[in-house]
């Protein structure tokens, strides 16, 4: 026996009139059967109509071995049709069916919107047998239902390779709003217009639209949703949501904030990372962006030396990564450092400024005066020069180097000597008699080696001649002596 | 050419201040630092601080901190000193000089007199 | 602060002679000397900037040398126009100074 047991809540007027079979309410039914083992009661609707022939998809059934008599077609009873509740809570429909007992294994399947429910759901079938039928009650439970379960659920039952579907029974979960589109936070330009979109859907239907804006309400008349705002411009950063309402009730969007694009803040913490004679590498942290991207940045080099012009160089890069190689700087010398960037609205303000130093470079400037000479007792090439005058810039002195190349007979060997800052003149042993002496000097300091002094050639006869006759650096302009000693 | 543009002479009695301009014409005013000197009648030159327009940024001869201002306007190309709590020892030619001192103003005579 | 040691403080040359004047700073500036010329009334003329260089337009009588602390201002066939006070200025380091000066005669 299926009873309804109590009725409670009222019912809500969603539709315009009863719909055939359709129960409206937020019943709550208790159901009193036979409950298989470990089944706990749950709320249902109860068939409690009356069945009636159902010629959709039905099974007729043979003859029986007397031959005699021809078994009514088998189908579902009718039960409710149309199923309204609220979100969160609990139902329970059930399909059934009376069945000759001469049929053997029926299994009842429930589907939803045509596919089968399988696995964890709660779904028990009952049998009643009695002589000649037993009758099979499959119910069907919900537990704190919710939009997804919305749909048309249908039992099938195979019966001799027959199908058997019951009418579809429409549950419908109603609810809060939903929204199936929210506003989305904005970065706009000042007194800009742009548009916000809301969107919610029931069931129940219609949702209607309110906007707000910083917690005032932006239109006095709701709209239908969807609804589209459109904010004509800001001055300043703002906070938008929507409220979605229904006949259930209300549903506050999140609250976006729609921020005003303004020129970034200046970079921070600009740092020195490497420092060469003519190059420094610095780096630098972009400052906040304004609500607009980066587009690039400006590093703006200062001379600050006390008697330098300070000249601005400005070098454009791009914003990422936030590091730049500042070139063609002078050597020891001092600069002022910056770094602005820009978005769409305009540039920032300067970074604070920083001081770096160039390091010293090599020498611009060759030794003078380099003579070169014959010691033949000594086996040796004697080889004088001047100290260059070198800027500071150029570093402090720390030696000198000499290329030396002996050339005879199509052997061609270069050598290299260094010597400390003090020496002004060096000798070297004589590497091939008969051959040809090629001798340049370059000053070296820290920042390097500097130019080469023009080449002075002097030729190393065989044993036994003697002239000790120097060799020495050209005159600025003439092709390169030859001294044959 | 570059020019650099400065009042003749300024009278202003003591313990009142003064604010020298220099309005620079003929190059990039944002680009080179604006010295200014200090001559006092028949005396040597001294030298107060410097500008760089670009930014803004001072540097000063600790002597001066505390007497003497530099700013600039830019939309004017103009470069200012103030100079405050005057007494004679302030009377004296002001200059201002452009980048390493190739260009000079023509001086204003700055009398503090009662 | 560096200073700058100006010298002599006044200097009477017979025309065509050859002045020098002197200025030694308190630090090594490299080469970081200015020279300048002011007749009265007017403001100071660069001579010679950083590096020893003569500056356009300078008559080729005027040189200079030094490096370091010791700078020499040199002024070759002593004209009537050269009759001014001479300065020098060092850019070694912040704050600029300036030498005493010089003044230059004409016996």
């Known amino acids: 026996a299926i009873t309804e047991a109590r009725e409670e809540a009222k019912p809500y007027p969603l539709f315009p009139g009863p719909l055939p079979g359709s129960l409206q309410t937020d019943h709550t039914s208790l159901l009193s059967l036979p409950h298989t083992s470990g089944y706990q009661p749950a709320l249902m609707f109860s068939p409690t109509q009356p069945g009636r022939p159902y010629t959709g998809n039905v099974a007729i059934p043979r003859v029986t071995s007397a031959g005699s008599k021809l078994l009514p077609p088998l189908a579902f009873k009718h039960t409710v049709g149309h199923i309204i509740l609220s979100e969160h809570k609990d139902v329970k429909f059930n399909c059934s069916i009376s069945v000759p007992n001469i049929y053997q294994d029926t299994t009842i399947s429930w589907w939803k919107d045509g596919k089968e429910l399988l696995g964890a759901h709660h779904a028990i079938t009952q049998f009643y047998p009695d002589d000649e039928v037993t009758a099979i009650i499959a119910s069907f439970s919900i537990t704190s239902v919710q939009r997804s379960d919305n749909g048309s659920y249908i039992c099938k039952m195979k019966i001799n390779n027959e199908e058997i579907v019951s009418d579809p029974i429409y549950i419908e979960v109603q609810g809060l709003p939903h929204f199936t589109k929210q506003p989305e936070s904005m970065n706009v330009t000042r007194n800009t217009a742009f548009n916000l979109t809301c969107q919610a859907v029931g069931p129940p239907e219609p949702v209607n639209i309110f906007w707000v804006q910083n917690s005032s309400r932006v239109n006095e008349q709701p709209e239908k949703s969807p609804s589209v705002l459109t904010v004509p411009g800001l001055t300043e950063m703002a906070v938008f949501s929507c409220e979605a309402h229904n006949d259930k009730g209300l549903t506050v969007s999140k609250g976006v904030q729609i921020n005003i694009k303004a020129i970034p803040s200046p970079p921070t913490e600009v740092s020195i990372h490497n420092s060469t004679a003519h190059s420094i590498l610095i780096s630098w942290v972009p400052g906040f962006d304004g609500y607009s991207p980066f587009r690039n940045c400006s590093v703006q080099v200062k001379e600050v030396d006390p008697l330098s012009n300070g000249s601005v160089m400005i070098f454009n890069t791009s914003a990422s990564p936030h590091m730049y190689q500042i070139k063609q700087l002078q050597a020891l010398a001092n600069y002022s450092i910056g770094v602005s960037c820009m978005n769409e609205i305009g540039w920032s303000a300067v970074s604070p400024w920083i001081l770096a130093s160039t390091t010293e470079g090599a020498p611009s400037v060759a030794p003078l005066n380099v003579t070169v000479f014959l010691n033949e007792s000594r086996d040796n090439v004697d080889i004088r020069w001047m100290k260059p005058l070198t800027k500071r810039q150029a570093g402090e002195l720390v030696g000198y180097r000499i290329s030396h190349v002996w050339q005879s007979a199509g052997i061609s060997k270069e050598l290299l000597e260094e010597v400390g800052q003090n020496n002004s003149r060096a000798q070297i042993s004589v590497q091939v008699h008969n051959a040809t002496c090629t001798v340049r000097i370059a000053a070296v300091t820290k920042g390097g080696v500097g130019p080469f002094s023009d080449p002075v050639k002097i030729f190393i006869p065989a044993h036994g001649w003697v002239d000790h006759a120097p060799s020495s650096t050209p005159a600025p302009g003439n092709a390169d002596p030859v001294l044959i000693i | 050419q570059v020019q650099l543009q400065q009042p003749g002479a300024e009278l202003v009695k003591p313990g009142a201040s003064v604010k020298v301009s220099c309005k620079a014409s003929?190059?990039?005013?944002?680009?080179?630092?604006i010295h200014w000197v200090k001559q006092r009648p028949g005396q040597g030159l001294e030298w107060i601080g410097r500008?760089?327009?670009?930014?803004?940024?001072?540097n000063y001869n600790q002597k001066f901190k505390g007497k003497a201002t530099l700013t600039v306007d830019k939309s004017s190309s103009t470069a200012y000193m103030h100079l405050t709590s005057l007494t004679s020892e302030d009377s004296a030619v002001y200059y201002c000089?452009?980048?390493?001192?190739?260009?000079w103003g023509q001086g204003t005579l700055v009398t503090v007199s009662a | 602060e560096t200073t700058v040691t100006q010298s002599p403080a006044s200097l009477s040359m017979a025309m065509g002679e050859k002045a020098t004047i002197r200025c030694i700073t308190s630090t090594d500036i490299d080469d970081k000397m200015n020279w300048y010329q002011q007749k009265p009334g007017k403001p100071p003329k660069l001579l010679i900037s950083a590096g020893n260089t003569l500056r356009p337009g300078v008559p080729s009588r005027f040189s200079s040398s030094g490096y370091g602390t010791d700078f020499v201002l040199t002024v070759e066939n002593m004209l009537s126009e050269d009759v001014a006070d001479y300065y020098c200025l060092q850019g070694g380091a912040l704050p600029l100074t300036f030498g005493s000066g010089t003044k230059l005669e004409i016996k």
């Open positions: 000089a452009l980048a390493s001192f190739a260009y």
């Open positions: 500008i760089h327009p670009f930014d803004s940024e001072p």
């Open positions: 003929g190059y990039t005013f944002t680009n080179y630092w």
